[in-house]
Amino acid sequence: VPDKTVRWCAVSEHEATKCQSFRDHMKSVIPSDGPSVACVKKASYLDCIRAIAANEADAVTLDAGLVYDAYLAPNNLKPVVAEFYGSKEDPQTFYYAVAVVKKDSGFQMNQLRGKKSCHTGLGRSAGWNIPIGLLYCDLPEPRKPLEKAVANFFSGSCAPCADGTDFPQLCQLCPGCGCSTLNQYFGYSGAFKCLKDGAGDVAFVKHSTIFENLANKADRDQYELLCLDNTRKPVDEYKDCHLAQVPSHTVVARSMGGKEDLIWELLNQAQEHFGKDKSKEFQLFSSPHGKDLLFKDSAHGFLKVPPRMDAKMYLGYEYVTAIRNLREGTCPEAPTDECKPVKWCALSHHERLKCDEWSVNSVGKIECVSAETTEDCIAKIMNGEADAMSLDGGFVYIAGKCGLVPVLAENYNKSDNCEDTPEAGYFAIAVVKKSASDLTWDNLKGKKSCHTAVGRTAGWNIPMGLLYNKINHCRFDEFFSEGCAPGSKKDSSLCKLCMGSGLNLCEPNNKEGYYGYTGAFRCLVEKGDVAFVKHQTVPQNTGGKNPDPWAKNLNEKDYELLCLDGTRKPVEEYANCHLARAPNHAVVTRKDKEACVHKILRQQQHLFGSNVTDCSGNFCLFRSETKDLLFRDDTVCLAKLHDRNTYEKYLGEEYVKAVGNLRKCSTSSLLEACTFRRP
């Protein structure tokens, strides 16, 4: 019988008492085969973290700073359940740490040196740890003691709870630096008052502070937020302009064998029986013998953290950077305006080989990082392990939802000013063999399908979106008799036609021979009835243009396109017979790397782009024997985006809407994780 006990870790007598009450009340409402609670008492949260790692306990609720400690080796814990605040309809699991300034003050984030600062309190998250952690490498050396470095960075501050004797500048704006509400500038509202009164130039607070202190929109309009990209935004645009997004209070468990499903089952049932306004005799979110025992008193309920989310993703790049800076205190030798090497994310070993060659030729400008799937690469860019990669539009959508930004677009047509003119896009098509003359768009049911990969534009999002509108369900594996759609569940009929061997079967990378445009076309040639690809795929792999044995004798005339009106047309008539226009592939990165990625890639394409004529004796960035490694092989240049610099603007309203509609069919664990952070 599986052990269905969750051993909860308590850190005080009062918590242990509440835990025992929790245990007894759960016993009274949950059947004997359901989850149960046991209580383990430890002296501190860090002891609880160690106990969970050592399998002596299973769960504890922590604030963000401790979630970071819990994630560090050797603990390796992960977030599994989040407390939420506000309403069930609009649950808040995160708050945003922001830098608020007066509208007319005219300086940016990178011009804070010499300004006067207002903090909620020394050592507090939004008011100190996050802003000072992010500014850490700009502080004057020596950076220890930290208070002295901060005092020398700003021209005056109010940092309640600081030592006013040793660091008088930190108390200059609030004499005495009192550590309670007796100090008018203490806490969130106090720090904001410090700004409002004109004592300080910037206040480091939570996003909600401004709304709690200024009910009137006209008053709020006198303030702005400083963004990390050295711009400003209105105070209600905090989701796009903050220092960090911080989880409020989170249950953590072991990463391996951590009972996360059991913990969720327990807490979900607990909130049903003992949540807000549920029971008089025991309340989960109430602490008669103290404050915030086991859970925050202000919590309204629990949400399950998506399984794909590790602590780094949950805490977010900015928060992790800030805390790591404060804890480790390491900075680059001397901050320069020079760009660091761009860490390119390569999929599997074929892309890695090309990336390595690029890296050797780039003379220190490009480094390589490997991952097995596109989603793993996106996750690595999010957390700073990698910086950039070029993505199909479907993944630009996911990357955008995860906070990444497009920076350059692949262009496929030769033109005089290629780099200045991003193209409208390419065509997504459905290709069939000419010999299968009865096949049309209207009778694809039961046929064998070939897709570039799940989640990609031409191979999945466009054809499956159109199909979904017709069949109104997501069971595409039942619609087609079999197929190859790399990235599908291994036991799905949409992996049946794939050719990868062993663990590589149906993998969404080049180890699966039917992956990508060329792979999907090969699948049609060898096994399938229809392939969903781009309009250039057939000409690029016929007429001897692809020398691989399977392709070298193919003739473009032996293939036709399916049109949405039920007719068929020759391959060259794609402009009048396609499924939809698809946005070109684009390079994505984190916002903080945008300028450097842009600069370095433009240099790199001038050295190794399509101006290189002899690819047998030189490195060519846009060539890989029709395998589209790192970039599509038909890329002519990487073009500036001008104002299309967000994923929504880049992909266009129509495509974003189409992918949004397909979301209900999404199997993307990363998309689920990212929409948890930003619904």
Partner: nanobody
């Protein structure tokens, strides 16, 4: 297509040195990029060092300051001088010129380097 044959590996004590050679069956003067990779048991193959025709080089962080890559176009040979060897340098070492493309999984026999006391 140029064939490449690696040699020079062997058993060496920690702190010792080895010089690996990679002899090409034809001219390497026109080959842009050449590189040494290594693969330890149960690990992915990783880039150790690379060199371009113009002589610019790149090294993995783990070997910087200890290993030196060079090429002699007249002798059609690529070299890897390995000093201050450590047990974690134990692996099979391969050379490549990338000319077979990134997709063909063709690698030579390689040469085994074992660093152990």
């Amino acid at each position: 297509e140029v064939q490449l044959v690696e040699c020079g590996g062997g058993l060496v004590q920690p702190g010792g040195s080895l010089r690996l050679s990679c002899a090409a069956s034809g001219s390497i003067a026109g080959i842009n990029t050449m590189a040494w990779y290594r693969q330890a048991p149960g690990q992915q193959r990783e880039l150790v060092a690379g060199i371009t025709r113009s002589g610019s080089t790149k090294y993995a962080d783990s070997v910087k300051g200890r290993f030196t890559i060079s090429r002699d176009n007249a002798k059609n040979t690529l070299y890897l001088q390995m000093n201050s060897l450590k047990p974690e340098d134990t692996a099979v070492y391969y050379c490549t010129d990338y000319s077979r493309g990134y997709y063909q999984d063709y690698w030579g026999q390689g040469t085994q380097v074992t660093v152990s006391s």
